[in-house]
Amino acid sequence: APTSSSTKKTQLQLEHLLLDLQMILNGINNYKNPKLTRMLTFKFYMPKKATELRHLQCLEEELKPLEEVLNLAQSKSFHLRDTKDLISNINVIVLELKGSETTLMCEYADETATIVEFLNRWITFCQSIISTLT
C-alpha cells in the first residue's frame, strides 16, 4: 500500500509535470508565437484511456514528436528553456511516475490531435490524478 510519503512524492512529481506541460502550452498559445500555424499541423496521438499513472506510457511515446515541434517553435518571441533539457526532465518524471514493473502497450485513439489538444489532455490527466491524491 502506498505510504503518505510516497503519495506526497507522487503528488509533487505530478505537480512538476503539470507545470512543465502548462509552461509549454502557455508558450505555444502566446499570440507572438510566429510558428503557431505550422506547429498546429503536427499530428499527436492520444491515449484511448488515460486514468492511471501507468497510462503515462502514452505520453512518454509522444515526447520525441513534442521535442521536434518545440525545436521548430524556438524564436526570439517564443523561447522555452533548452528544449532537450525540458523534454529530458519530463521524461524522467514520467518514467518515475509510471513505474517500470509492467510494460504497457499504449492504445491510441483513431483520431489524431494538435499539440494544443495533446497538451490539454495531459494537463487534465495530471489535474485529475492530483485531485484523487489530495
Epitope: T41, K43, F44, P65, E68, V69
Partner: antibody
Framework: EVQLVQSGAEVKKPGESLKISCKGS????????IGWVRQMPGKGLEWMGI????????RYSPSFQGQVTLSADKSISTAYLRWSSLKASDTAMYYC???????????????WGQGTTVTVSS | DIQMTQSPSSLSASVGDRVTITCQAS??????LNWYQQKPGKAPKLLIY???NLETGVPSRFSGSGSETDFTFTISSLQPEDIATYYC?????????FGPGTKVDIK
C-alpha cells in the same frame, strides 16, 4: 531500407475509373505524410495533394480538388490515388513521395516511388 | 498559390564548370525550399532541403543558399552524371508548388 513501391503501368479508356497504389516499407508508414505528384509527358512536376495514413487526413491542391481522391489503408501500409472518370488529359506519370519530417506536412519529400504511368486513350 | 520561377530554363556547361540556378518565390517562404534532381526516366531525388541543407548521401559539390524570395542552387564542378532537370519546391504554404525546372546538359 526505406522504400515506396508503386503499382504498374495502366492503359485505360476515357470515362473509366482507376486506382493506383503506393506501398511503403522500412519505416513507420502511419507516421509520415504521403504526397502525390503528377508529371505530364515532357513537362514539370505538379503537386497534387497529401494524405496522413494514420487518420487519412488529406490536403488537396485546388487544381486537383474534386478530380482525384487520396486514400490509405494503414493495415497494409498502402496509399492510393483514385479517379472515378478518367480523361485523356490525365495521361501522365504519377509519383508518390514521403514527407521528410513525419507528423507534419511542412517538410520536403525525401523518398519517392518509382512512378506509375497512366495512359488514357480511346 | 505561391508561384515559383527558375532561371535559366536550360543550360549547357562543360565538365568541371561551376553551374548556378536561381529560384524565385512570389512571396516570402523563409527557408522552406527544396531542390530536386530528376534524371531522364527516373523519379526525382531530394538534394537540398531547408534551402541549404545537403541530404544524406548527396555529393558535396551540390549546395544551396538563399532565404525569403531568392534562392540559388550551385554545382561547384559539373560531372557527366549531373545531366538532369533540377526543380525547386516551396513548402511554406499549401499547395507546395514546384518551379518549372532547369535542364542541365554537357557541352
Amino acid at each position: 531500407e526505406v522504400q515506396l513501391v508503386q503499382s504498374g503501368a495502366e492503359v485505360k479508356k476515357p470515362g473509366e475509373s482507376l486506382k493506383i497504389s503506393c506501398k511503403g516499407s522500412g519505416y513507420s508508414f502511419t507516421d509520415y505524410w504521403i504526397g502525390w505528384v503528377r508529371q505530364m509527358p515532357g513537362k514539370g512536376l505538379e503537386w497534387m495533394g497529401i494524405i496522413y495514413p494514420y487518420d487519412s487526413d488529406t490536403r488537396y491542391s485546388p487544381s486537383f480538388q474534386g478530380q482525384v481522391t487520396l486514400s490509405a489503408d494503414k493495415s497494409i501500409s498502402t496509399a492510393y490515388l483514385r479517379w472515378s472518370s478518367l480523361k485523356a488529359s490525365d495521361t501522365a506519370m504519377y509519383y508518390c513521395a514521403r514527407h521528410r519530417g513525419g507528423r507534419s506536412y511542412y517538410y520536403g519529400m525525401d523518398v519517392w516511388g518509382q512512378g506509375t504511368t497512366v495512359t488514357v486513350s480511346s | 498559390d505561391i508561384q515559383m520561377t527558375q532561371s535559366p530554363s536550360s543550360l549547357s556547361a562543360s565538365v568541371g564548370d561551376r553551374v548556378t540556378i536561381t529560384c524565385q518565390a512570389s512571396q516570402d517562404i523563409s527557408n522552406y525550399l527544396n531542390w530536386y534532381q530528376q534524371k531522364p526516366g527516373k523519379a526525382p531525388k531530394l538534394l537540398i532541403y531547408d534551402a541549404s541543407n545537403l541530404e544524406t548521401g548527396v555529393p558535396s559539390r551540390f549546395s544551396g543558399s538563399g532565404s525569403e524570395t531568392d534562392f540559388t542552387f550551385t554545382i561547384s564542378s559539373l560531372q557527366p552524371e549531373d545531366i538532369a532537370t533540377y526543380y525547386c519546391q516551396q513548402y511554406e504554404n499549401l499547395p507546395f508548388t514546384f518551379g518549372p525546372g532547369t535542364k542541365v546538359d554537357i557541352k
